[in-house]
Interface confidence: low
């Protein structure tokens, strides 16, 4: 990766000695790009979703050496400047989760509750087992709500 420092130059150019000068980007207007900042440096051009910088921004100048994330293990879902991909989410069976959609290079794993488990929060890191009713069910357990049970002694319809 080729870059150079010059106190007299702030733009990519060729000076009288034929040296390449590289501007450093000190303002970033693009929104929602992850990993913009590294050791006081800004990278110039992001890697596409599903890839990462082969090495850190400080080495890279404005032409990123982008390499793929590990299929099934890592992903990046948007353009970014990071030298790391994100680790795929694990759907922890011990917490009542199972895989709904497998992780790809460009999309994180999507988890859902296992059968007979539910989660009533917007982000589910674990699912709770559905309550087993001793005296009958008013409403079945769903992925997002627990079973509603009849109380002891309540009359059935």
């Amino acid at each position: 990766r080729l870059s150079s420092k010059s106190v007299n130059a702030q733009v990519t150019d060729i000076n009288s000695k034929g040296l390449e000068l590289r501007k450093t980007v000190t303002t970033v207007e693009t929104q929602n790009l992850e990993g913009l900042h590294h050791d006081g440096q800004f990278c110039h051009k992001p890697c596409p979703p599903g890839e990462r910088k082969a090495r850190d921004c400080t080495v890279n100048g404005d032409e990123p050496d982008c390499v793929p994330c590990q299929e099934g293990k890592e992903y990046t879902d948007k353009a970014h400047f990071s030298s790391k991909c994100r680790r795929c989410r694990l759907c922890d069976e011990g917490h009542g989760l199972e895989v709904e959609i497998n992780c790809t290079r460009t999309q994180n794993t999507k988890c859902r509750c296992k059968p007979n488990f539910f989660c009533n929060s917007t982000v589910c890191e674990h699912c709770d087992p559905c309550t087993k009713c001793e005296h009958g069910i008013i409403k079945e357990c769903t992925l997002t709500s627990n079973t509603k049970c009849k109380e002891e002694g309540s009359r059935s319809n």
Epitope: L2, R22, C47, V59, C66
Partner: antibody, heavy 115, light 111 residues
Framework: EVQLVETGGGLVQPKGSLKLSCAAS????????MNWVRQAPGKGLEWVAR??????????YYAESVKDRFTISRDDSQSMLYLQMNNLKAEDTAMYYC??????WGQGTTLTVSS | DIVLTQSPASLAVSLGQRATISCRAS??????????MQWYQQKPGQPPKLLIY???NVESGVPARFSGSGSGTDFSLNIHPVEEDDIAMYFC?????????FGGGTKLEIK
């Protein structure tokens, strides 16, 4: 996995011409600057040429020793890098490596210039 | 051009000991607070293999026995403890300015 495979080396007579090729895979070729580096038998490493990406107008740079004789080019659609070498001299005899700006190297291809 | 002077030209070290190779640049290779200096290992019939980038960052898969240090114009590569597999040529390289330049190389041998 990043892969760079150089081809096209061989035996050429002085003042002859030859074109080296480098097939790239495993990374986003079209956004990367690419380089040729050579190594004469039993000698050190010498940078030869560099070509930047389309967004940098395919700007090219050459070592003084090859200027006006060698031409670096690329075909982004095929992820190929080339080095056209004209008016070859005995001192151009070397192993030629294709190198990304990220310091990934190919295995090299050998050029021998001899009568 | 930036001239890189590597020393020593050859080095014989006992197994388990420390090997230190120096690289001095004719002008600073600093780039906005980082030094664009690389170290390579090359074995016969093989292309150079990246060991260290940006002066001190160890490339993925390279043993922790290898370390790089320095800034500005003075850099060094340390190998400790030296192993049989480390017998090779070692080169420094700067990428701060075109043309990229390389040190003349250091041949590491075992005593």
């Amino acid at each position: 996995e990043v892969q760079l495979v150089e081809t096209g080396g061989g035996l050429v007579q002085p003042k002859g011409s030859l074109k080296l090729s480098c097939a790239a895979s495993g990374f986003t070729f079209n956004t990367n600057a690419m380089n040729w580096v050579r190594q004469a038998p039993g000698k050190g490493l010498e940078w030869v040429a560099r070509i930047r990406s389309k967004s940098n107008n395919y700007a090219t740079y050459y070592a003084e020793s090859v200027k006006d004789r060698f031409t670096i080019s690329r075909d982004d659609s095929q992820s190929m890098l080339y080095l056209q070498m004209n008016n070859l001299k005995a001192e151009d005899t070397a192993m030629y490596y294709c190198v990304t700006d990220g310091y990934y190297w190919g295995q090299g291809t050998t050029l021998t210039v001899s009568s | 051009d930036i001239v890189l002077t590597q020393s020593p030209a050859s080095l014989a070290v006992s197994l388990g000991q420390r090997a230190t190779i120096s690289c001095r640049a004719s002008e600073s290779v600093e780039y906005y607070g980082t030094s664009l200096m690389q170290w390579y290992q090359q074995k016969p019939g093989q292309p150079p293999k990246l060991l260290i980038y940006v002066a001190s960052n160890v490339e993925s898969g390279v043993p922790a026995r290898f370390s790089g240090s320095g800034s500005g114009t003075d850099f060094s590569l340390n190998i400790h403890p030296v192993e049989e597999d480390d017998i090779a040529m070692y080169f420094c390289q700067q990428s701060t300015k075109v043309p990229w330049t390389f040190g003349g190389g250091t041949k590491l041998e075992i005593k």
